[in-house]
Each structure stands twice: as structure tokens, then as C-alpha cells.
Interface confidence: low
């Protein structure tokens, strides 16, 4: 019968011919009367056999990630008779792994959005690297994740690649962060290969800023000929938040004369001062009103940021019109 051990050949061997093992018949007494032949994919090109001894050699550099095993057939023939000594047999040559592939992040680019002021431990995103080496071969494909850039705001779980918040962030100070994650194989041991990826983390806005008037005093004028409903001027507050969180409502806080109103232009986020009652220069030539501004939408949990609405004082001068 046939005699052989399991055949292994390391990938990426640089030698011109690498001895893999021997394939022989137990009828072979070593007097060179038998001839060994190799058949199948790779025979003659990748692998050769010594016809007299049955020694098998790899004559090409192999890449396990391209092909991890070869199935070949062996024949042994009695040279004198030309007849097969053993039935043709199939055998396997396995290509054994070396750590020649670095981890790769296949789902790049990574981008995540997380609300500003999120607490520590908040999940941001999970990054995953893959390694083409053999996961069953030692630690060649066992990965560990680490953070190269992003401290102190972010952390990464070493075995899962889960990125979490490690420090609260304020969108109004910085609205996006670039985090760089490294994946290292060989669980970080010597000879490890690594790959990196960048993650763009954007902070979404929460309503943590109240609108504040740009000026503590506004001066407007109104003609005594102006009809009721006339827009006599605008006041403006600013809000460091964005979008819906920056939408504001203006209102009168104090107007003893009941002469003016303020409506909100939600398009420009301005407060428009409206004449509610006609004015008469001879009757009163100036008015003082106090206005306030508040955000349109404030969730209950963010009310702590919105105590005491911002106010402003508006001096309104009446312009005289010559009467006939």
C-alpha cells in the first residue's frame, strides 16, 4: 500500500525547490525498479516528484490566501512491466499560513453622528477589520483594536472595535472629530501587522443654548402717520444652536402703553416690532418697551439651560408729521 504523512508546505517560501515529503509504496525495496508519477492541478508546474524516490517538492512560491490546498493524484509503476504497482491514489497538500496579511477595514469610510453632551459610555459606532490570514492558525488573524487619535473624547473596546464616548463634548466648541483606529493582528505580539482607519464623528445639536439679544438697547423710529399694523423695525437675538434648536419666539415683556406688539419672522429669526395703536407726536413723543426672546422648542430635560429669558429694552422715537 501507499505510505505517506500529511503534506504541508508553508506559503511564501522563497527557495527554488522546497521538500514537502515522500510518497512511496511499501513494496518499494529501494532498488530503483519503481517509477512515481504526479498528476492533477499543479503537477509539474507547482509540484514535482522524484520519479525514483517519490520525494515531492514545491517549485513555486505559494500563497495560502489565493489557494490553501491542492488535491493531486499519485501513480507508481513497475518499470520492468509497465504495470501499476498500487492503485492510483488521491492526496492533499495543504498550504500552511504565515502572517503576511495586515488587517483591513472594508467598510470605509466610517462616519457617525452622536448628540453633543452625550454621557460617557454612549455607543458611537463599531468598526470592524478583517484579516485574510488563517483564523485557525495561531494568532495570525486575531485582532486587537486601539485608538491612535481621539483621546480623551473617545475610547475603543480592544476586542470588538466598538467606539464609545469617554468625555462629554460641546458642538458649539467643536462640531466634528476625526478618530483614528488601529487594528493589529497577532493580538499585538511581535511580528504583528496593522491597519488603520479614520472615523468622522459629527456632533448633532441639542438645545443647550438659549437665544440672547445682540444689543441691550435698540432705537427705532415710527412716524405718527404710520397706520396700525406697520412694521417699525426689527430686533435680533442670536442662538449658538442650529436648526430647530435655534428657532426663537419674540414677545413683549413690558409695554405700559399697549401700543406695540412683536411678531417673529421664523424665516430670518428676527423679531418684528409692530404698531398696534396709532401714535401722536403731540401726545407722546417717545416710548420704551421691553422685549424677551425664548426658544421655540425646548425639551423638558434641557430646561436647565433656558432659565431666565434674555431681554432687551427698545426706545421708540415718534417722528413728527406736519399737519395741515
Amino acid at each position: 500500500g501507499w505510505v505517506w504523512n500529511q503534506f504541508f508546505v508553508p506559503e511564501e517560501m522563497n527557495t527554488t525547490s522546497h521538500h514537502i515529503g515522500q510518497l512511496r509504496s511499501d513494496l518499494d525495496n529501494g532498488n530503483n525498479s519503481f517509477q512515481y508519477k504526479l498528476l492533477g492541478a499543479g503537477a509539474g508546474s507547482t509540484f514535482i516528484i522524484d520519479e525514483r524516490t517519490g520525494d515531492i517538492y514545491a517549485i513555486q512560491k505559494l500563497d495560502r490566501e489565493e489557494r490553501s490546498l491542492y488535491i493531486l493524484r499519485a501513480q507508481v509503476i513497475d518499470i520492468a512491466t509497465g504495470r501499476a504497482v498500487e492503485p492510483e491514489s488521491e492526496f492533499v497538500i495543504k498550504v500552511s499560513d504565515i502572517n503576511d496579511n495586515e488587517p483591513k477595514f472594508l467598510d470605509e469610510p466610517y462616519e457617525a453622528i452622536v448628540p453633543e453632551m452625550s454621557p460617557e459610555g454612549t455607543l458611537v459606532i463599531q468598526v470592524t477589520a478583517s484579516d485574510a490570514d488563517d483564523p485557525s492558525s495561531g494568532n495570525n488573524a486575531r485582532l486587537l483594536y486601539s485608538l491612535l487619535q481621539g483621546q480623551p473624547y473617545f475610547s475603543v473596546e480592544p476586542t470588538t472595535g466598538v467606539i464609545r464616548i469617554s468625555s462629554k463634548m460641546d458642538r458649539e466648541l467643536q462640531d466634528e472629530y476625526w478618530v483614528i483606529i488601529q487594528a493589529k493582528d497577532m493580538i499585538g505580539q511581535p511580528g504583528a501587522l496593522s491597519g488603520t482607519t479614520s472615523v468622522l464623528i459629527k456632533l448633532s445639536d441639542v438645545n443647550d443654548n438659549k437665544p440672547i439679544f445682540k444689543e441691550s438697547l435698540y432705537r427705532l423710529t415710527v412716524s405718527e402717520s404710520a397706520p396700525t399694523g406697520t412694521s417699525i423695525g426689527t430686533i435680533m437675538a442670536y442662538d449658538n444652536d442650529i436648526g430647530e434648536n435655534a428657532e426663537m419666539d419674540y414677545s413683549i415683556e413690558e409695554d405700559d402703553s399697549q401700543t406695540f406688539d412683536i411678531i417673529t419672522n421664523h424665516e430670518t429669526q428676527e423679531g418684528i416690532v409692530i404698531l398696534k395703536k396709532k401714535v401722536d407726536f403731540e401726545h407722546q413723543n417717545h416710548y420704551g418697551i421691553r422685549a424677551k426672546v425664548k426658544n421655540h422648542h425646548v425639551p423638558e430635560q434641557l430646561m436647565k439651560y433656558h432659565t431666565e429669558a434674555s431681554t432687551t429694552f427698545i426706545k421708540i422715537q415718534v417722528e413728527d408729521v406736519d399737519e395741515p
Epitope: L220, G233, T234, E267, T268, Q269, E270
Partner: antibody
Framework: QVQLVESGGGVVQPGRSLRLSCAAS????????MHWVRQAPGKGLEWVAV????????YYADSVKGRFTISRDTSKNTLYLQMNSLRAEDTAVYYC????????????WGQGTLVSVSS | EIVLTQSPGTLSLSPGERATLSCRAS???????LAWYQQRPGQAPRLLIY???SRATGIPDRFSGSGSGTDFTLTISSLEPEDFAVYYC????????FGQGTKVEIK
């Protein structure tokens, strides 16, 4: 950066129609009122029409009222001017312009597109 | 509508000189809602001044605006070669109207 690019101009016969487009980029289109302004060859600027940020309000110069229609498509970040019953006096370079957020002046303008109404 | 009249029609000056452009409104422009634009040949207008006196982003401080009510002024303190252009005033107190323009040319 903010960019406004007009297109759709050309030579057209009196009484015919033309639609101008203005592709906006580099800003939140849906937050701004947008305008069309024209300039006849060798002449000054003439305001034509405005549309509010949400498309609910339009306002026209008397010279084009009833013939021109301003519209916008927020999903395409594009402003339009549909010009019907064109006259020789409508010949001009047409600019789209963005209205300042906290003001009513025009902070960004396109490069313009020429409309020639001629038989 | 508010009619804006600019003067002079043409201003012939040399680089380094001071330019003073006037814009008069047919009625009072409330809240100084007046802007100034520069238009170079073959180009679109560019916002210089809004609110009568506020410089737009990126505009050099040699440009200044002043005035209120019906009389407004654009001043260029020292003309640079690139300042020779047509200047328009615009009111946006009541709809939008432009002046007829003032051409600043090299003498």
C-alpha cells in the same frame, strides 16, 4: 463655498417662453429667500422676483407680474424662473441672488445667464 | 416705490484718490436698509455694504458707507486699480430697488 450657477438663457422670439434655472450649493438652500435680478445690456440692475425660504411666498416687480413665475425645488437645491409672453424689453442678463439671512440685501450672486428676446 | 438717484453718473479719478458716491432716496429708507454693490465689467454684482454702513464679509476697510433717511454715501478712501467699476445702491426697506449706478473710471 457658496455657489449659484444660472442656466437656461438663450435667444427666443417675442411671445414665447423660457425657463431659467439656478443651481445652489455650499449652503442650506432651504433656509434662504432667493431672488432674480436682471440687467439689460448697458443698463442698471432691476429686481425681478423673490421667493421665501419655504416657497410659500412670492413677490414680483410690476414689470413682470402675471408673466413670470418664481419657484424652487429644495430637493434639487434649485431656483427657477418661468418666463412667459416674453417681450423685447425682457432682454437682459438674469442673475439669481441669495438674500442675507439677517437682512434683505443680496450677499451672493450667480454669474448670470443672457436672455435675448428678438424676432 | 422708493426711487434711488445716484450721483454723479461718472466719477473720473486716479488711483490713490478718495471717491465719494452719493445715493438719494425719494422717501426715507427705514432702519438704514440700504446696500451698496460693486460690479466690474462682465461680472456679477458684489455686496460691499449693507445696513448703510456695515461692511460685508471680505470687503477691505477702504470701503465705508454712511447716511440715513434719504441721503447715503459710499466712500472709497484710496482707490486701488481693481476699484474702478460701477457702483449701485439698493434699498430694501420697501421691496427692492436699485439706483441707476455710478461709474468710477480712471482719469
Amino acid at each position: 463655498q457658496v455657489q449659484l450657477v444660472e442656466s437656461g438663457g438663450g435667444v427666443v422670439q417675442p411671445g414665447r417662453s423660457l425657463r431659467l434655472s439656478c443651481a445652489a450649493s455650499g449652503f442650506t438652500f432651504s433656509s434662504y429667500d432667493m431672488h432674480w435680478v436682471r440687467q439689460a445690456p448697458g443698463k442698471g440692475l432691476e429686481w425681478v422676483a423673490v421667493i421665501s425660504y419655504d416657497g410659500t411666498n412670492e413677490y414680483y416687480a410690476d414689470s413682470v407680474k402675471g408673466r413670470f413665475t418664481i419657484s424652487r425645488d429644495t430637493s434639487k437645491n434649485t431656483l427657477y424662473l418661468q418666463m412667459n409672453s416674453l417681450r423685447a424689453e425682457d432682454t437682459a442678463v438674469y442673475y439669481c441672488a441669495r438674500e442675507r439671512y439677517f437682512d434683505w440685501s443680496f450677499d451672493y450672486w450667480g454669474q448670470g445667464t443672457l436672455v435675448s428676446v428678438s424676432s | 416705490e422708493i426711487v434711488l438717484t445716484q450721483s454723479p453718473g461718472t466719477l473720473s479719478l486716479s488711483p490713490g484718490e478718495r471717491a465719494t458716491l452719493s445715493c438719494r432716496a425719494s422717501q426715507s429708507v427705514s432702519n438704514t436698509y440700504l446696500a451698496w454693490y460693486q460690479q466690474r465689467p462682465g461680472q456679477a454684482p458684489r455686496l460691499l455694504i449693507y445696513g448703510a454702513s456695515s461692511r460685508a464679509t471680505g470687503i477691505p476697510d477702504r470701503f465705508s458707507g454712511s447716511g440715513s433717511g434719504t441721503d447715503f454715501t459710499l466712500t472709497i478712501s484710496s482707490l486701488e486699480p481693481e476699484d474702478f467699476a460701477v457702483y449701485y445702491c439698493q434699498q430694501y426697506s420697501n421691496s427692492w430697488t436699485f439706483g441707476q449706478g455710478t461709474k468710477v473710471e480712471i482719469k
